[in-house]
């Protein structure tokens, strides 16, 4: 057992059918030592009495709020929730596996520059009696400081039957620079609560590797006189870090016929305008890439040739 | 990356090109690795990122753009003269690098030489025969000392008497390897910014 | 104590469908995940499916993906294994499991797929 | 397909020391623990070992189990008649958890 915050304490049990548990004893929180009570939660059954109470912890019935009473007095209150070890390995029961980019991947994050400034979400199916806390460091034997604001649902989604929600949170790395060559990982850990079962989930990258920038800005197209070629032009993103010249990106350039069973001409290039040809009907598209090393693509900016 | 590119002529900056060659080849190096030693471990999550410069040469600090000079996190071990000697940069305007930005980037890559092809000989006795590293990648790093032009002085190959432990030798290799990458992108930035200025 | 006593094997032809059943006693049955295991004649044990305490999520083993349901019920306190388009190979004694680091097995039922 | 790789088998004399080997790879037993079950002829599985050493009750002390990187061993010391069975190690990988991946089984003879 261990105290997850004031008042709150996790139990970690090995999670199988008729499983022995494991005891816990509870202090009352008083400088009382007599004619004190127990309770569970909005029971008024009496568990037991005296300044301490022993119970056998098995089972999500046998979580929950205790509370220490003195003549209809509340003295302290200590919240049991329960860890699930299931066959060795800690239950991922209120999270869902985002299988990207590989399976197991609970916590997802992003990056738009160099700047140690981050995003992680997660998705889940709950709706209700959830809670999460975030924290970071770089590096785990001595932690440099992350500072992470609080996780907020950002966005809810219809899969099939069930509703989906998506919830994110911001961190920023206390004293990042830009140029540095990370050698310790930024560490992710989420503790998630769902009514009376407590869970954790980590994550852990190089900023250089999360990295996705914005889609290029300004996307303009000038059409080239007496020719179907056009001068596409754009700029890179805002959030991208700068100096442009340090921290270069390339580009791709797609030309994609209104149907998506057309070929699509690809370019690539490190300038920040290339010529191709517009089809009718036709759209063309841009995204960008850390030039020197290849994390992830930025979403597409896109203009039609018309 | 693999993708078709139309790069731009590097123009009056020779390291430019050198430098795009190294990190193309030591990319390549490294998934290769990844691939041939798939039993072992030699991606990034598994490996110990170890930096054979550390304490010895100061890239990142020295070759640091201005722009940066402001932002406190990176001003840790600045040295603050500005360099004079140096073929890469021919006639082109210098003020705007630290003193020991290229001088740095040579020792890099003397150092890196030096551990690759100590690291060679040793995987030229394995029976396994498993692992070789790539003369491209080797020669990519001599080319670009040669554009350097520095002189400094040549560090002895390191020989050993004992029988080489293969296995840890190849997860040395992807250890180097990674962090060669992670310099070999610094130093392409740098020469990008030089050749900009 | 924990029990769990399995039912609907038998002998089927090749293509046709066969559910399996295993009914558990003696615990919280809808807080536990629960396996499919099965073992061919004179070979080894290969896992089939598992599904988690509250039937929300279902994982397969490649050689049934498709072709095999796993389900429970937890008010009856029962676990199924819908079996289609049955092949020749899937002959064998199929075990219902509990998860966990202690586990609890069926007896076993044949499922025999012959023409 | 069988990830973990046992002898198909092994045999000894009653009082002997009989060892299998279980060996697999980083994802599986260098990244989760190992079980061991003994399988009589016509029985369901039986559960000896779990979490790589730990003896569930009831399970006789002459059997050890242990892990080391990507190996896992099961030892039986002072074999008995009573113990010829077939062995199978189990592990999971951690890709595809919570599928089960067993080992490919090791029949235990005990010899005179």
């Known amino acids: 057992i261990w105290e997850l915050k004031k008042d709150v304490y996790v139990v970690e049990l090995d999670w199988y059918p008729d499983a022995p548990g494991e005891m816990v004893v509870l202090t009352c929180d008083t400088p009382e030592e007599d004619g004190i009570t127990w309770t569970l939660d909005q029971s008024s059954e009496v568990l037991g009495s005296g300044k301490t109470l022993t119970i056998q912890v098995k089972e999500f019935g046998d979580a929950g709020q205790y509370t220490c009473h003195k003549g209809g007095e509340v003295l302290s209150h200590s919240l049991l929730l329960l860890h699930k070890k299931e066959d060795g390995i800690w239950s991922t029961d209120i999270l869902k596996d985002q299988k990207e980019p590989k399976n197991k991947t609970f916590l997802r994050c992003e990056a738009k520059n160099y700047s140690g400034r981050f995003t992680c979400w997660w998705l889940t199916t709950i709706s209700t009696d959830l809670t999460f806390s975030v924290k970071s460091s770089r590096g785990s034997s001595d932690p440099q400081g992350v500072t992470c604001g609080a996780a907020t649902l950002s966005a809810e989604r219809v899969r099939g039957d069930n509703k989906e929600y998506e919830y994110s949170v911001e961190c920023q790395e206390d004293s990042a620079c830009p140029a540095a060559e990370e050698s310790l990982p930024i560490e992710v850990m989420v503790d998630a609560v769902h009514k009376l079962k407590y869970e954790n989930y980590t994550s852990s990258f190089f900023i250089r590797d999360i990295i996705k920038p914005d889609p290029p800005k300004n996307l303009q197209l000038k059409p080239l006189k007496n020719s179907r070629q056009v001068e596409v032009s754009w700029e890179y993103p805002d959030t991208w870090s700068t100096p442009h010249s340090y921290f270069s990106l390339t580009f791709c350039v797609q030309v994609q016929g209104k149907s998506k069973r057309e070929k699509k001409d690809r370019v690539f290039t490190d300038k920040t305008s290339a010529t191709v040809i517009c089809r009718k009907n036709a759209s063309i598209s841009v995204r960008a890439q850390d030039r020197y090393y290849s994390s992830s693509w930025s979403e597409w900016a896109s203009v039609p040739c018309s | 990356r693999n993708l078709p590119v139309a790069t731009p002529d590097p123009g009056m900056f020779p390291c430019l090109h050198h430098s795009q060659n190294l990190l193309r080849a030591v990319s390549n190096m490294l998934q290769k690795a990844r691939q041939t030693l798939e039993f072992y471990p030699c991606t990034s999550e598994e490996i110990d990122h170890e930096d054979i410069t550390k304490d010895k040469t100061s890239t990142v600090e020295a070759c640091l753009p201005l722009e940066l000079t402001k932002n406190e996190s990176c001003l840790n071990s600045r040295e603050t003269s500005f360099i004079t000697n140096g073929s890469c940069l021919a006639s082109r305007k210098t003020s705007f690098m630290m003193a020991l930005c290229l001088s740095s980037i040579y020792e890099d890559l003397k150092m890196y030489q030096v551990e690759f092809k100590t690291m060679n000989a040793k995987l030229l006795m394995d029976p396994k025969r498993q692992i070789f590293l790539d003369q491209n990648m080797l020669a990519v790093i001599d080319e670009l000392m040669q554009a350097l032009n520095f002189n400094s002085e040549t560090v002895p190959q390191k020989s050993s008497l004992e029988e080489p432990d293969f296995y840890k030798t190849k997860i040395k290799l992807c250890i180097l390897l990674h962090a060669f990458r992670i310099r070999a992108v610094t130093i392409d930035r740098v020469m990008s910014y030089l050749n900009a200025s | 104590q924990v029990q769990l006593v399995q039912s609907g094997g038998g002998v089927v032809q090749p293509g046709r469908s066969l559910r399996l059943s295993c009914a558990a006693s003696g615990f919280t049955f809808s807080s536990y995940g629960m396996h499919w295991v099965r073992q061919a004649p004179g070979k080894g044990l290969e896992w089939v499916a598992f599904i988690r305490y509250d039937g929300s999520n279902k994982y397969y083993a490649d050689s049934v993906k498709g072709r095999f349901t796993i389900s429970r019920d937890n008010s009856k306190n029962t676990l199924y294994l819908q079996m289609k388009s049955l092949r020749a190979e899937d002959t064998a004694v199929y075990y219902c499991k509990t998860h966990g680091s202690h586990d609890n097995w069926g007896q076993g039922t044949m499922v025999t797929v012959s023409s | 397909s069988y990830v973990l790789t046992q002898p198909p088998s092994v045999s000894g004399t009653p009082g002997q020391r009989v060892t299998i080997s279980c060996s697999g790879g980083?994802?599986?037993?260098?990244?989760?623990?190992v079980k061991w079950y003994q399988q009589l002829p016509g029985t369901a599985p039986k559960l000896l070992i779990y979490e790589n050493d730990q003896r569930p009750s009831g399970v006789p002390d002459r059997f050890s189990g242990s892990k080391s990187g990507t190996s896992a061993s099961l030892a039986i010391t002072g074999v008995q008649a009573e113990d010829e069975a077939d062995y199978y190690c189990q592990s999971y990988d951690r890709g595809t958890h919570p599928a089960l991946l067993f080992g490919t089984g090791t029949k235990v003879t005990v010899l005179g």
């Open positions: 980083r994802s599986n037993i260098g990244s989760n623990t």
